[in-house]
């Protein structure tokens, strides 16, 4: 677009008189006349040849500048060849000078010539001949001068004729500037163009409707003294819920979807998921549906999968192990794990409770990604009821029934709980007595006690056991100087306890020379 | 404004002299050459030549040369056209015209009254 | 020397119709020549020059035209006033008139 140029004058598209100023007013004259097109122009002319050391003046009005600071003057000239008047050749001359004067406001009709400042002295590329009158297209002279930077308000140009013989076919005063564009989203309004001729003027650029600036990254151009955009820097993007149609940013339609300024695009809604308005940033879910806190928005709403199948128990004692195949449905996930709830359920109206913090599970009560799960520390002969649930990412959003496997079991006799409070009640050189108190829980009657032992470096690689049925005991025949582990268990019909924790000993040294040895107190004699 | 005066109407003899003036008024007299055309009874118009106002440099056209002589007096802004030896056939209106030299032509732009020479014996 | 013919001699045109008046040049011309009316008992008026350049206060309705050998005077809308004798003028070196026209009422 030629547009860059903001005119301040024209006088080509003048049709009425243009009344500059002429002094003398002999000197320049207008004239209307045709153009090349046979458009009626208003031109002035000069041609004074006869006559030595012409000094004619043509000043046009008064020019505002509007905010510009560089100024273009086009120049649209003809110039008749000296050669071509007949008579003249000592006085006529073939170049004019340019001028300007700057000032604030409109000085009025006179000329002061000395305030003026030339710009140039103006030379036809072309002149033209006798030869040349019949044409209609005649050697017209083109030539574009700039004045600037300016400090007024306006200025005047003015023409010096000094004898030549020249039609000033068009003058346009113009200034350049980058005219408002929308580049990567930003919109950059226009700007004049710099003072310098190789001034850059930076310009910010505002976001399109519905975009935001791309993080750390602000749009910038820059408008050349040619009033040009040069590269941009920086972009708009738009925002969440838009997307780029040329130089907007449209909403997107109803079932899509754009979660982010960084996506390119709005997509499809995901399944399961819908948007029924326009510029939607993240589609809602179906009913029934639902999207875990960490899911991201391009993924399908899911569901609590369905509940296990194929649940199986197996019983041994005070222990359960139970065991399911996953389950139907997923949900559309594959973050299921599975979580066990334990109820102990009374033998007559069937009213069950949690069952307490006593039991074990293993591996885990909750989380488990395996489909089997050990339950111990059960009471014995008590009815029971396990739910086995299949959770996934969004179970804990759902207001809807939990969907479970269900088994109900009665445990059998339990073996005792483990011994507790085991001391060494004397220590001598070849025998250890120890104490210990009866588990909390025999769970039935403890039918004898088991104690184990080993030497401590032996590493259980061979060991000793001695049977009682009392809470203490002497074990005898023991090594001199030696540090023993015992262990000790009860035993009932159902079967036996766990093993007290490690206990260590140390015999005493052989003392040099014969000793008093004390018999230990035992309900019963180790069996060698 | 503008404008050539010349004098009243001429009756000659033949073989005498006549020298019509043109005086200019309203512009810079130097700064314009000054044409002469002779119009004969029920005739057209024929350019006799014409004279450059600021060196005095005459030019004559094709039949004008000899008898006829271009001057000035530039103190007084006269263009003089003189006719020696007249003849019956220089019987005529004559007229001074100024020259307008422009970029794009030329022409005869402000013109004498026209002054009338009868040739008669 | 380069001779002028016009034609015709007499155009009889009635007030309001568009007149157009021819002026062969007896060889190719470069320059477009002048054209002036004259009236009974005055001296002529200098009405175009260059082809494009109406003189001072010389109405739009007068125009001219051509190039080469034929050049045409046209009256858009004859006037009353403009019943006259109109003559082309070439110039150059040498410079001469054509024998005219007269425009008359029809």
């Known amino acids: 677009q030629a547009a860059k140029e903001v005119l301040l004058l024209d006088s080509k598209a003048q049709q009425t008189e243009l009344e500059w100023i002429s002094s003398p007013p002999s000197g320049w004259e207008e004239i209307s006349g045709l153009d090349e097109n046979y458009t009626p122009i208003r031109t002035y002319q000069v041609c004074q040849v006869m006559e030595p050391n012409q000094n004619n003046w043509l000043r046009t009005n008064w020019i505002s500048k509007g905010n510009a600071q560089r100024i273009f003057v086009e120049l649209k000239f003809t110039l008749r060849d000296c050669n071509s008047l007949p008579g003249v050749l000592g006085t006529c001359k073939e170049t004019f000078n340019l001028y300007y004067y700057e000032t604030d406001y409109d000085t009025g009709r006179n000329i002061r010539e000395n305030l003026y400042v030339k710009i140039d002295t103006i030379a036809a590329d072309e002149s033209f001949t006798q030869g040349d009158l019949g044409e209609r297209k005649m050697k017209l002279n083109t030539e574009v001068r700039e004045i600037g930077p300016l400090s007024k308000k306006g200025f005047y140009l003015a023409f010096q004729d000094v004898g030549a013989c020249i039609a000033l076919v068009s003058v346009k005063v113009y200034y350049k500037k980058c005219w408002s564009i929308v580049e990567n989203l930003a919109v950059f309004p226009d700007t004049v163009t710099g003072s310098e001729f190789s001034s850059l003027v930076e310009v910010r650029g505002t976001c399109v409707s519905s975009a935001e600036e791309e993080a750390e990254n602000s749009p910038r151009m820059h408008c050349s003294a040619e009033g040009e955009w040069l590269v941009p820097i920086g972009k708009c993007i738009c925002k969440a819920g838009y997307q780029q149609k040329g130089d907007t940013c449209e909403p997107c339609g109803r079932r899509f979807y754009k979660s982010s300024s960084q996506d390119l695009q709005c997509s499809r809604c995901p399944t399961h998921s819908f948007s029924d308005r326009e510029g939607s940033s993240r589609c809602e879910c179906e009913d029934g549906y639902y999207r875990a806190p960490s899911d991201p928005p391009y993924v399908a709403c899911t569901r609590p999968p369905s509940a296990p199948q194929n649940l199986i128990f197996n019983i041994n004692q005070t222990t359960v192990s139970l065991e399911w195949s996953p389950p139907a449905d997923n949900g559309g996930r594959n973050d299921v794990t599975y979580r066990i709830l334990c109820k102990r359920c009374s033998w007559e109206q069937g009213e069950c409770v949690p069952c307490g913090s006593n039991i074990g599970y293993m591996p885990q009560q909750t989380g488990l990604e395996d489909n089997y799960v050990t339950v111990m520390d059960l009471l014995a002969h008590a009815n029971y009821t396990f739910e086995v649930e299949a959770v996934n990412g969004v179970s804990d959003l759902s207001r809807s029934q939990r969907l479970f496997a269900a088994v109900s079991i009665t445990t059998g006799q339990a073996a005792p709980s483990q011994v507790s409070g085991v001391m060494k009640e004397r220590v001598l050189q070849r025998s250890v007595q120890l104490s210990w108190q009866e588990p909390e829980h025999p769970n039935g009657v403890i039918t004898e006690y088991e104690i184990k032992y080993y030497e401590k470096d032996q590493r259980e690689r061979t060991y000793s056991t001695l049977k009682t049925k009392s809470t203490s005991a002497s074990i005898n025949n023991l090594k001199p100087g030696t540090v023993y582990v015992f262990q000790i268990r009860a035993v009932t019909a159902a079967g036996y306890g766990n093993y007290s924790p490690r206990l260590d000993v140390a015999t005493l040294e052989e003392a040099s020379g014969k000793m008093f040895e004390a018999t230990a107190v035992s309900s019963e004699q180790n069996p060698v | 404004q503008v404008q050539l005066l010349q004098s009243g109407a001429e009756v000659k003899k033949p073989g005498a002299s006549v020298k019509v003036p043109c005086k200019a008024s309203g512009y810079t007299f130097t700064s314009r050459a000054m044409s002469w055309v002779r119009q004969a009874p029920g005739q057209g118009l024929e350019w006799m030549g014409w004279i450059n106002t600021n060196t005095g440099n005459p030019t004559y056209a094709q039949g004008f040369t000899g008898r006829f002589v271009f001057s000035l007096d530039t103190s007084v802004s006269t263009a003089y056209l003189q006719i020696s030896s007249l003849k019956a056939e220089d019987t005529a209106v004559y007229y001074c015209?100024?020259?307008?030299?422009?970029?794009?032509?030329?022409?005869?732009?402000?013109w004498g009254q026209g002054t009338l020479v009868t040739v008669s014996s | 020397e380069i001779v002028l013919t016009q034609s015709p001699a007499t155009l009889s045109v009635s007030p309001g119709e568009r007149a157009t008046l021819s002026c062969r040049a007896s060889?190719?011309?470069?320059?477009?020549p002048a054209w002036y009316q004259q009236k009974p008992g005055q001296a002529p008026r200098l009405l175009i020059y260059g082809a494009s350049t109406w003189a001072t206060g010389i109405p739009d309705r007068f125009s001219a035209s051509g190039s080469g050998t034929d050049f045409t005077l046209t009256i858009s809308r004859v006037e009353p006033e403009d019943f006259a004798v109109y003559y082309c003028q070439q110039y150059g070196p040498s410079w001469t008139f054509g024998q005219g026209t007269k425009v008359e009422i029809k």
């Open positions: 060889q190719s011309v470069s320059s477009n």
């Open positions: 015209a100024r020259v307008r030299f422009t970029v794009y032509g030329d022409g005869m732009d402000v």
